[in-house]
């Protein structure tokens, strides 16, 4: 029986060009975490395996950093990074737990202020 629950950072926002940490935490189970997959809309971002360590997908190598912990750091954010992210915890003997995070990447406050206070 699967008793665990995934806690995530939920809905988060960050500025374009900045970075953000995606974090999930599995609680209420004694199951062994064997692997965590990080995915974005049917794309593999990274995997952290208990035995093999981290694997970052080649297409994200320049903008994704492992950690902290089982989390994932996204860097040099663009508006195209807006969307759903999933942490998939593979555990033994429970099975698979999935957490969801929604990230919104906003235009930087500098750009917003620049637009707002333009001299006529």
């Amino acid at each position: 029986m699967m008793t665990g629950t995934i806690e995530t950072t939920g809905n988060i926002s960050a500025e374009k060009g900045g970075s953000i940490i995606l974090q999930c935490h599995l609680s209420s189970t004694t199951a062994q975490v064997t692997q965590v997959n990080w995915e974005q809309q049917d794309q593999l971002l990274a995997i952290c395996n208990a035995d093999l360590g981290w694997h970052i997908s080649p297409s994200f190598k320049d903008r994704v950093a492992p950690g902290p912990g089982l989390g994932l750091t996204l860097q040099s954010l663009t508006v195209n990074d807006t969307g759903e992210y999933f942490c998939i915890y593979h555990t033994y003997p429970d099975g698979t737990y999935t957490g969801r995070i929604f990230l919104e990447v906003l235009e930087s406050s500098v750009a917003e202020h620049g637009a707002r206070f333009q001299i006529p």
Partner: antibody
Framework: EVQLLESGGGLVQPGGSLRLSCAAS????????MSWVRQAPGKGLEWVSD????????SYADSVKGRFTISRDNSKNTLYLQMNSLRAEDTAVYYC???????????WGQGTLVTVSS | DIQMTQSPSSLSASVGDRVTITCRAS??????VNWYQQKPGKAPKLLIY???SLQSGVPSRFSGSGSGTDFTLTISSLQPEDFATYYC?????????FGGGTKVEIK
């Protein structure tokens, strides 16, 4: 250099048994999930079984369930496939394969031929 | 079980041609598709994993795309050493299943 070397294939009569071995070297064997994949003469690839690294949980294709047993000895860096109640349709080249992150197969052995015939 | 339907089963092409092979899954499998190349008498070789990631050491003329149920392997400019059989494989769930293969022959 990663190497996977299968052995134990040969000619066996229907109903007989064989034990295949796969000696692994060039990587930390105990850290990887491993699989057996087979290929009948002139046919495509068919997954047979796999075994996870640490927990050692196993999975089998329906066609071999109850007849084949996958196991590993991490102290000997060796993967095994015990094949019982062999049938003519089990005739194939059997490949040992490494499965990082349980998602893809990045290295294959050269294969060992199993022929089941009377 | 998830069925992987690969097409075409064979094709004839010339050196320099752009070649596209498709694979359709019987249900949505996210990005869990890998592509392999096999030459006669040899073991398969990994080309693309997780739908679009190029395996280390594989020439950049090979690329993969797709998600959900429809996946594509593309060879941008076919080379003499690329004449072989290509297989897709899903790793979304057990039993792991392969496509029937696409044999790429010289025209």
């Amino acid at each position: 250099e990663v190497q996977l070397l299968e052995s134990g294939g040969g000619l066996v009569q229907p109903g007989g048994s064989l034990r295949l071995s796969c000696a692994a070297s060039g990587f930390t064997f105990s850290s990887y999930a491993m699989s057996w994949v087979r290929q009948a003469p002139g046919k495509g690839l068919e997954w047979v079984s796999d075994i996870k690294s640490s927990a050692g949980s196993t999975s089998y294709a329906d066609s071999v369930k109850g007849r084949f047993t996958i196991s590993r000895d991490n102290s000997k860096n060796t993967l095994y496939l015990q094949m019982n109640s062999l049938r003519a349709e089990d005739t194939a080249v059997y490949y040992c394969a490494r499965v990082p992150y349980s998602v893809w197969i990045d290295y294959w052995g050269q294969g060992t031929l199993v022929t089941v015939s009377s | 079980d998830i069925q992987m339907t690969q097409s075409p089963s064979s094709l004839s092409a010339s050196v320099g041609d752009r070649v596209t092979i498709t694979c359709r899954a019987s249900q949505s499998i996210s990005y869990y598709v890998n592509w392999y190349q096999q030459k006669p008498g040899k073991a398969p070789k990994l080309l693309i994993y997780a739908a679009s990631s190029l395996q280390s050491g594989v020439p950049s003329r090979f690329s993969g795309s797709g998600s959900g149920t429809d996946f594509t392997l593309t060879i941008s400019s076919l080379q003499p050493e690329d004449f072989a059989t290509y297989y897709c494989q899903q790793s979304y769930s057990t039993p792991l299943t392969f496509g029937g293969g696409t044999k790429v022959e010289i025209k």
